[in-house]
């Protein structure tokens, strides 16, 4: 047993070009938190199968808010380390994943709303017992600096944490055959009750006469490293150099899966068949449970009362994933009007509007015409967003304010002298020529394409166009 | 505060029909956009038609010319009329809707259905 700590030195903007903008503002301040996820081994695992050694979850880091124009430093952290807990033997090579969240503390409905803003993973050897060991990670615009170790949780010492130390029971020295224990030298290590010649370095038990190994490591006593080459078959050839299996015992033999678990040889080694509630290389992990508060945003975590049971999350509506850290798009039903952008931002939808529109769902044509009347007895036409006046005789412009030369459009045909009037413009036709705009030709007989003119009123007269 | 719920769904073998129902209820409401989402084990929630904030209808590639969505607006209803089902349609089946309630819009969800095409 034992526990692996994780230390955050730094969340923040990575070196180069495009620095991120703050997650927090003003209007929003937030504060961070980080989860890790542990799995054995080496293999890329997709970031939603279970955290087979362990999770943990920070505290919340101090409030920050943005400074207006400021570029974005590195972000205040929460104060600790993050431990992880992990019962059984150190796997001596690990996956991790971690996360950065951010935590809105604007005054949004229904408490805080957490959002997903970096998350890093990788793959590592590590013994326990050694030093803190350094890491920069990067994602996207954002860099995450920290450092990690495993310790073994007495009596437990070694590489794996598999090696069991006891107090002396003689105040000089341990008994015959037996170690002191470092670093703490006043206690000497148990008997050793692995099957003889197990190897010290690469394998371990639990129980008297067993001999399980570490990743990497096969045969019955752990002696033989698992081949990264490609073999000719599982039992390959038998050669020290290949570093491929030798003939003789096969990978499973002994069973090397633990808790029940089934083995099944593959070209390269072996592969356990866990039962419900182990999970690791050797099934040697049991699961997350509820009380490691796996679920995020609200998730009820159900099942996983004790190790031996597979924890679910019921996600609340609007979040999904195995841990309700991801959120359903809401967008893509399109909630805003007139081609405004939607944005999800967990506690609410937004609409950015276009120019001309406003309101929560972009539903309002704003109204122009509002408060703003056209002068002179203009009248005010609205229509996308924007608004114009169609002025009365005589008058133009934005606001039908200005005085508008009716004759400037040479509105007179055939020829007609143009005159402006006080209540529109006068057309003074050419001989042959009659109506408002001069348009229709007086035949030749004297008759007009016209209905007869009204009385007082001859061919050629200046007609007044009312 | 709004409820959404819905009816229709069961089992169906490939090729047949189904329809689905959500009524949405409550006092004082106006629906902006209201629509269906479905849910695949092991799966996202993702969008599988709708009426946009303009009214407009939008369907997911997957099922479009199969999928018909449409509305009853005087009881407040939409449905998803589903043909030539196939078993990748398989999945939950969640109505949503955003929804106008005095000056603000929430967002509301169905309590789902489950959708099961196989022979």
């Known amino acids: 047993a034992g526990v692996f700590e994780l230390q955050i030195h730094s969340f923040g903007p990575g070196p180069g070009p495009g620095a991120p903008r703050s997650p927090c503002s003003a209007r929003l301040p937030c504060r961070l938190f980080f989860r890790v996820c542990l799995k054995p081994g080496l293999s890329e695992e997709a970031a939603e199968s279970p955290c087979a050694l362990g999770a943990a979850l920070s505290a919340r880091g101090p409030v920050y808010t943005e400074q207006p124009g400021a570029p974005a430093p590195d972000l205040p952290l929460p104060d600790g380390l993050l431990q992880v807990p992990f019962r059984d033997a150190w796997p001596g090579t690990f996956s991790f994943i971690i996360e950065t969240w951010r935590e809105e503390l604007g005054d949004q409905i229904g408490g805080p709303a957490w959002s997903l803003l970096a998350r890093v993973a990788g793959r590592r050897r590590l013994a326990a017992g050694g030093p803190w060991a350094r890491d920069i990670q990067r994602a996207g615009a954002w860099e995450l600096r920290f450092s990690y170790r495993a310790r073994c949780e007495p009596p437990a010492v070694g590489t794996a944490c598999t090696r069991l130390c006891r107090p002396r029971s003689a105040p000089s020295r341990c008994g015959p055959g037996l170690r002191p224990c470092a670093p703490l030298e006043d206690e000497c290590e148990a008997p050793l009750v692995c099957r003889a010649g197990c190897s010290p370095e690469h394998g371990f038990c639990e129980q008297p006469g067993e001999c399980r190994c570490l990743e990497g490591w096969t045969g019955p006593l752990c002696t033989v490293p698992v081949s990264t080459s490609s073999c000719l078959s599982p039992r390959g050839p038998s050669s020290a150099t290949t570093g491929c299996l030798v003939p003789g015992p096969g990978p499973c033999d002994g069973n090397p899966c633990a808790n029940g678990g089934s083995c099944s040889e593959t070209p390269r080694s072996f592969e356990c068949t866990c039962p419900r509630g182990f999970y690791g290389l050797r099934c040697e992990v049991s699961g997350v449970t509820c009380a490691d508060g796996p679920c995020f945003n609200g998730g009820l975590c159900v099942g996983g009362a004790d190790p031996d049971s597979a924890y679910i999350c019921h996600c609340p509506p609007g979040f999904q994933g195995s841990n309700c850290e991801k959120r359903v798009d809401r967008c893509s039903l399109q909630p805003c009007r007139n081609g405004g952008l939607c944005l999800d931002l967990g506690h609410a939808l937004r609409c950015r509007c276009r120019a001309g529109f406003a309101g929560p769902r972009c539903e309002h044509d704003l109204d122009d015409c509002a408060g703003r009347a056209c002068a002179n007895g203009g009248t005010c036409v609205e229509g996308g967003g924007a608004h114009r006046c169609s002025c009365a005789l005589g008058f133009g412009g934005r606001d039908c304010r200005e005085r508008a030369d009716p004759c400037a459009a040479r509105p007179c045909a055939h020829g007609g002298r143009c005159y402006a009037h006080f209540s529109g413009l006068v057309c003074a036709c050419a001989p042959g020529y009659m109506g408002a705009r001069c348009e229709f030709p007086v035949h030749p007989d004297g008759a007009s394409a016209l209905p007869a003119a009204p009385p007082g009123l001859r061919p050629g007269d200046p007609q007044r166009y009312l | 505060e709004v409820q959404l719920v819905q009816s229709g769904g069961g089992l169906v073998q490939p090729g047949g029909s189904l329809r689905l129902s959500c009524a949405a209820s409550?006092?004082?409401?106006?629906?902006?956009?209201i629509g269906w989402y479905r849910q695949a084990p092991g799966k996202q929630r993702d969008m599988v038609a709708g009426?946009?904030?303009?009214?407009?209808?939008t369907y997911a590639d997957s099922v479009k010319g199969r999928f018909t969505i449409s509305r009853d607006n005087a009881k407040n209803t939409v449905y998803l009329q589903m043909n030539s089902l196939k078993p990748e349609d398989t999945a939950v089946y969640y109505c949503?809707?955003?929804?106008?309630?005095?000056?603000?819009?929430?967002?509301?969800w169905g309590q789902g259905t489950q959708v099961t095409v196989k022979p």
């Open positions: 009426f946009t904030g303009d009214g407009v209808t």
């Open positions: 409550g006092s004082d409401f106006s629906i902006n956009a």
């Open positions: 949503a809707a955003d929804v106008k309630i005095g000056g603000d819009y929430e967002w509301f």
